[in-house]
Interface confidence: low
């Protein structure tokens, strides 16, 4: 009989507010206290096995006693009344947990979205965390119907998937309850027809063909979602070249109304293309569709839209009464190519006399010429036609060139190595730009660019490399033939030198030394060198460091004493910095010459 | 003014072809289903089917299936009812109307919803030998 | 298909008469009913979408009620312009749309 408990506690399964104040009753069974020789004096309370101070009890009468938590800041408590039986041993009475929380607040931002195909989903804020179960139940009602409540399930407590298919063109109230032990709370009402909440699915089978008649479009077609048949859709068209990462939009008011194709013009020719659309009802009222799966392809070709960079260089070794030129030109790059390049024809006219054809796979043409003057043309040619033509001027073998730019400069800025001039007063036809990089190993290596006769600043388009020196040679070109060359030495980033200079001596004296080194090799400059210096000392001695100009490759060391050990090294500066080079002695003699002990 | 025109009153001999067209103007043709009704004489209305312009998506009543046929050209915003062989029980007047876009969505399928809310004027057909 | 039966086929009224007539569904159709007026030598005209919403333009004189498979149309005062033939028609399930026989209003 006595298992069963010695009484109780009251309330037997409390919630409340976090910070509240709570008071807990434990009122004892006569049989116990007759039992156990106790009262409710006898009665001690404890919170997770932890004795609660007496001050918290309140003796109600000789079987209760109450005991009283302010501002509960503890989620869980464990709470057991006991009593204090004989020779002070513990009895537990009973025990209870009091969990508390939060009341839900209101939800707020209810929204809903009917995806086409699925049923209508709302969700919405549900507020702070209560830390006890509270359960969401969306609302929703015709005017005349009330439908089944949608319970939100505990792992998406903030959305919920009606039971019922959606109406449209019927207006729909929705909201959120919100309760938990703590007490109820409702959302504001929303009121509204599904219609100007649909997610369409996004078109689908986009498809891209090109035109022959028109290089610069495309035509795109698509299925409609079947949503087609409740609204009326606009949409949002996005295309990028094939390799580009930035989408370009259609503009939407061409787009604006249910439609199954459209034709996308103002585009590069024989360029690939990929297109995306989405859609959505064309009020605006709604959520746009996924994007539809890309689509791609690619615009029909064009005739070249430019005539190539032309050059030539003539073969200084000359035949007596001939020469070797060599003609060259560059490849266009696709966007001017505008289709596969079947290839290149050539024309060269001896001044006032006949002309030679030459049709050519490659982007050079080596030809003996008189020493005549000619007249070099060059188009280039694809499936849809040819380009403008080139024209080039070779003068004739007693040309003097004249009228050269003026003030040359180069200078790296931006990873780039850019070129400027002050152009001729002359007229120029075009500019010719040569490069390469000058080296004690190897020749120097010609790669050269073409700009327009308007162009005084430009940046050279190769693959160039840091630390190496550039010789750059910009000729002007005339309609009678290319004026004088002028050149310039630049880097794209200099470097401190991979070597310093070696340095000896040239003559010894008593109290002075001349010393000579060598320039430094190109190869091993990486960059323009500014000055050296020299440092020299005697074994015991302080270091002593003489700047020098870089254009010298001797100094003299003056103030030395006599019969003395000097070590002397040399650096060689660019604008990144220095490079020691080794280090070499030499002893000052004891005596002049002719000079006697 | 949302309007539908129809062509004019045909006689036709049984055998013949015929071809019936419906314009709409005032709104966005393509966005919107066209249906077509027969009214036979003296008698009620009776439903032949439906067509959606943009994409010529077509859904007939069982009773018209194989009997007829119904297209759009979108790029003059008609639609258009045709016979390949007419019958004398063809004889009729038959009406286009615009189906104003009502739809209740179930899963993946949909149920027409309001109405027809254009009505063309109609076309009367007499087939007689 | 669903079948929709009219009644009465006719009816005999005078001017500021209440009438009443009725559809009924052979298979529940929810809400998806409307009703069509048409007037002899011209086309139907849309009265009532959805059961009771009036279409825009129509006198509120008209009024529809009903859901699942017994449909009312009610002229609240008969007026000389309302004497035709009016057609009850269901979308709930297409194809194919099905209509009424229809029920002649004539005068008394």
């Known amino acids: 009989e006595l298992l069963d408990p010695c009484g109780y506690i009251s309330p037997e399964s409390p919630v409340v507010q976090l910070h509240s104040n709570f008071t807990a009753v434990c009122v004892l069974k006569e049989k116990c206290m007759d039992y156990f020789h106790v009262n409710a004096n006898y009665i001690v309370w404890k919170t997770n096995h932890f004795t609660i101070p007496k001050e918290q009890y309140t003796i109600i009468n000789r079987t209760a006693s109450s005991v009283t938590f302010t501002d509960i800041a503890s989620l869980n408590i464990q709470l057991t009344c006991n009593i204090l039986t004989f020779g002070q041993l513990e009895q537990n009475v009973y025990g209870i947990t009091i969990i508390s929380g939060l009341p839900p607040e209101k939800p707020k931002n209810l929204s809903c979205i009917v995806n086409e195909g699925k049923k209508m989903r709302c969700e919405w804020d549900g507020g702070r965390e209560t830390h006890l179960e509270t359960n969401f139940t969306l609302k929703s009602e015709w005017a005349t119907h009330k439908f089944a409540d949608c319970k939100a399930k505990r792992d998406t407590p903030t959305s919920c998937t009606v039971d019922y298919s959606t109406v449209y063109f019927v207006n729909i109230e929705v909201w959120v309850e919100a309760e938990n032990a703590l007490g109820k709370v409702t959302s504001d009402h929303i009121n509204f027809d599904p219609v100007y909440k649909v997610k369409p699915n996004p078109p689908h089978n986009l498809s891209v063909i090109n035109s022959e008649e028109l290089s610069s479009i495309l035509k795109l077609t698509w299925t409609n979602p079947s949503i087609k048949s409740v609204i009326i859709l606009k949409y949002n068209i996005q295309y990028r070249t094939k390799d580009a990462s930035t989408w370009s939009q259609i503009p939407p008011e061409d787009t604006a109304s249910t439609r199954s194709s459209f034709t996308v013009q103002d585009l590069k020719p024989f360029t690939e293309y990929v297109f995306r659309i989405r859609c959505m009802k064309e009020d605006g009222k709604g959520y746009w569709s996924d994007w539809s799966e890309e689509a791609s392809g690619i615009t029909y070709e064009d005739r070249p839209s430019k005539a190539p960079s032309f050059w030539y260089k003539i073969d200084p070794s000359h035949t007596q009464g001939y020469r070797t030129v060599q003609l060259v030109w560059k490849t266009l790059p696709p966007f001017e190519a505008n289709g596969k390049i079947l290839d290149y024809e050539v024309t060269l006219t001896r001044w006032k006399s006949h002309l030679q054809n030459y049709t050519v796979n490659a982007t050079k043409l080596t030809v003996n010429l008189t020493n005549d003057r000619y007249l070099a043309t060059l188009t280039v040619r694809n499936l849809v036609g040819k380009s403008d033509a080139a024209v080039l001027t070779i003068p004739a073998c007693d040309f003097q060139a004249t009228h050269p730019v003026m003030d040359l400069k180069a200078f790296p800025k931006d990873n780039m190595l850019w070129v400027e001039w002050t152009t001729p007063r002359e007229s120029v036809k075009k500019y010719i730009l040569e490069w390469c990089v000058l080296s004690d190993k190897a020749p120097c290596i010609t790669d050269w660019q073409q700009e327009d006769g308007t162009v005084h600043r430009t940046y050279l388009r190769g693959n160039l490399a840091e630390s190496k020196c550039y010789l750059i040679t910009v000729t002007p070109v005339y309609a009678d033939g290319p004026g004088s060359p002028e050149s310039i030495k630049a880097y794209l980033k200099q470097a401190p030198p991979s070597k310093g200079p070696t340095v000896r001596t040239k003559k010894v004296g008593k109290n002075e030394a001349v010393l000579e080194w060598d320039q430094l090799p190109v190869d091993v400059q990486n960059g323009f060198i500014r000055n050296y210096t020299i440092f020299y000392r005697t074994i015991i001695g302080n270091e002593t460091a003489v700047n020098v100009d870089s254009s010298h490759t001797e100094y003299t060391l003056s103030s030395l004493t006599s019969d003395t050990l000097y070590m002397v090294r040399m650096a060689a500066y660019t604008d990144e910095g220095g490079k020691d080079g080794p280090e070499f002695t030499f002893t000052t003699p004891k005596f002049a010459q002719g000079e006697i002990e | 003014e949302v309007q539908l025109v129809q062509s004019g009153a045909e006689v036709k001999k049984p055998g013949e072809s015929l071809k019936i067209s419906c314009k709409g103007s005032g709104y966005s043709f393509t966005s919107y289903w066209i249906d077509w009704v027969r009214q036979m004489p003296g008698k009620g209305l009776e439903w032949m089917g439906i067509?959606?312009?943009?994409?010529?998506?077509?859904r007939y009543s069982p009773s018209f299936q194989g009997q007829v046929t119904m297209s759009v050209d979108k790029s003059i915003s008609t639609a258009y009812l045709q016979w390949s062989s007419l019958k004398a029980s063809d004889t009729a007047i038959y009406y286009c109307?615009?189906?104003?876009?009502?739809?209740?969505?179930?899963?993946?399928?949909?149920?027409?919803?309001?109405?027809?809310?254009?009505w063309g004027q109609g076309t009367t057909v007499t087939v007689s030998s | 298909d669903i079948q929709m039966t009219q009644s009465p086929s006719s009816l005999s009224a005078s001017v500021g008469d209440r009438v009443t007539i009725t559809c009924r569904a052979s298979?529940?159709?929810?809400?998806?009913l409307n009703w069509y007026q048409q007037k002899p030598g011209k086309a139907p005209k849309l009265l009532i979408y959805a059961a009771s919403s009036l279409q825009s333009g129509v006198p509120s004189r008209f009024s529809g009620s009903g859901s699942g498979t017994d449909f009312t149309l009610t002229i609240s005062s008969l007026q000389p312009e309302d004497f035709a033939t009016y057609y009850c028609q269901q979308s709930y399930s297409t194809p194919p749309i099905t209509f009424g026989q229809g029920t002649r209003l004539e005068i008394k």
């Open positions: 298979q529940s159709i929810s809400s998806y």
């Open positions: 109307a615009r189906h104003e876009r009502g739809i209740v969505e179930a899963g993946t399928d949909y149920y027409y919803y309001y109405g027809m809310d254009v």
């Open positions: 067509i959606y312009p943009d994409d010529s998506d077509t």
